[in-house]
Amino acid sequence: QDPYVKEAENLKKYFNAGDPDVADNGTLFLDILRNWKEESDRKIMQSQIVSFYFKLFKNFKDDQRIQKSVETIKEDINVKFFNSNKKKRDDFEKLTNYSVTDSNVQRKAVHELIQVMAELSPAAKIGKRKRSQMFRGRRASQ
Amino acid sequence: QDPYVKEAENLKKYFNAGDPDVADNGTLFLDILRNWKEESDRKIMQSQIVSFYFKLFKNFKDDQRIQKSVETIKEDINVKFFNSNKKKRDDFEKLTNYSVTDSNVQRKAVHELIQVMAELSPAAKIGKRKRSQMFRGRRASQ
């Protein structure tokens, strides 16, 4: 049994998340995850799910009763989702921590928008000239 | 030239994001995107970046001076990042809109945690027995 299971059960007790009424009105994450089979689609969704859990854990980080459980689960997420790659985790954390109401952050984000957009589709990974031809092709052919 | 370029330039004017000082203290997104070449890693990062821009655009949605620009860019993101797939966009939006301070949402999230964790690594897509063997191997080799 993976280490997170026992700790997740502990969190369930703490949050009364084992009660039958918790399942009312559908799931938060599970139905969405079932919709997406392609690895890249799953990563888009899991990225949001993981950032949700990190925020949730942050809100309860000072509660001694669940501190060990939270730390074990975070460590397991780091192994499973970030492949124990600290740089990947650090980059992810940076992105989740930017404040959308900070005017300097807003200006930077808008400044970078054109380059971010240019890289959004998988086609963006090939060389510039080839890409522009391909995307014209996409615009004209898909 | 892709249609978003002109509209992004308009946003730059609006936010004074063309000023030389905007580049001070490094980039928000571009350096991070340069770090990740694997498609699934890129999707993890782009998922956070796209949700940032959507939040930013939401904050300025009633400003007539940039409304057309924002709508064009959002449409372009939907074509490029979500492949014009509204179901993908809808699932993404649901995930970004959950409130981490809502106690019902918290309980649901903790209730689903074990199953979410079980699916976090790409190995999770193969059969259960095979996965447990493979994951022992992964944990020992990473």
């Epitope: - | 709508e71 449409e75 014009s84 509204k86 179901k87």
Partner: antibody, heavy 124, light 111 residues
Framework: EVQLVESGGGLVKPGDSLTVSCVAS????????IHWVRQAPGKGLEWVAT????????FYSDSLRGRFTVSRDNANNSVYLHMSSLRGEDTALYYC?????????????????WGRGTLVTVSS | NFMLTQPLSVSGYPGKTIVISCVRS????????VQWFQQRPGSAPAMVIY?????PSGIPDRFSGSVDASSNSASLTISGLKTEDEADYFC??????????FGGGTKLTVL
């Protein structure tokens, strides 16, 4: 009230070209994708092409790519389908259909509003 | 090669319930929305279900839509069948980037 009105159909010879038009009203035209869907006499529905709203990206059915070109004029609430090298099997009723507003996460349904169609007959 | 396969014809008596299936040949049915259209002779298609299970305004609750990932199919159910329901029904979904896909259509006969 949302309305889509197609025009420009008619009888043409094999190998000829033809452009059919669609004029829309009752909604913010530039926000919406527009589809062309055709139906041969007594047959099912076949998607032909789509053009996005403000970005004007074009998407085509694999079987028709190269012969058909979709375009739009947002200032005049109009969409066009230019068809070249026409064949007998292109004979059909061509429908103009409103798609999603992809800039709005609460967009009305895709393919909810249809025109009445314009008939294109390809025959020698 | 993506296909949506429907039965050619379905029939039922007034007041009864019929189900029209729409099987997706490849790709996951759950990864794209499914719509259903009713087409009466001489008329343009009219939507009866959008985004898997939602009804446009004016469509009675006798019409319902569902998606089953295990069979990779969508279904349109019409209960309390009426003579006016006699028509052709088409399912529709997507593949790739905005590629629209229609099923072959099902002729519903009310006996």
């Amino acid at each position: 009230e949302v309305q889509l009105v197609e025009s420009g159909g008619g009888l043409v010879k094999p190998g000829d070209s033809l452009t059919v038009s669609c004029v829309a009203s009752g909604f913010t035209f530039s926000n919406y994708f527009i589809h062309w869907v055709r139906q041969a006499p007594g047959k099912g529905l076949e998607w032909v092409a789509t053009i996005s709203g403000r970005t004007k990206y074009m998407f085509y059915s694999d079987s028709l790519r190269g012969r058909f070109t979709v375009s739009r004029d947002n200032a005049n609430n109009s969409v066009y389908l230019h068809m070249s090298s026409l064949r007998g099997e292109d004979t059909a009723l061509y429908y103009c259909v409103r798609g999603y507003d992809h800039s709005d996460s609460n967009s009305a349904a895709d393919l909810l509003h249809w025109g009445r169609g314009t008939l294109v007959t390809v025959s020698s | 090669n993506f296909m949506l396969t429907q039965p050619l014809s379905v029939s039922g008596y007034p007041g009864k319930t019929i189900v029209i299936s729409c099987v997706r040949s490849s790709g996951s049915v759950a990864s794209h929305y499914v719509q259903w259209f009713q087409q009466r002779p001489g008329s343009a298609p009219a939507m009866v279900i959008y985004e898997d299970s939602h009804r446009p305004s004016g469509i009675p609750d006798r019409f319902s839509g569902s998606v089953d990932a295990s069979s990779n199919s969508a279904s349109l159910t019409i209960s309390g069948l009426k003579t006016e329901d006699e028509a052709d029904y088409f399912c529709q979904s997507y593949y790739g980037n905005n590629q629209v896909l229609f099923g072959g259509g099902t002729k519903l006969t009310v006996l």
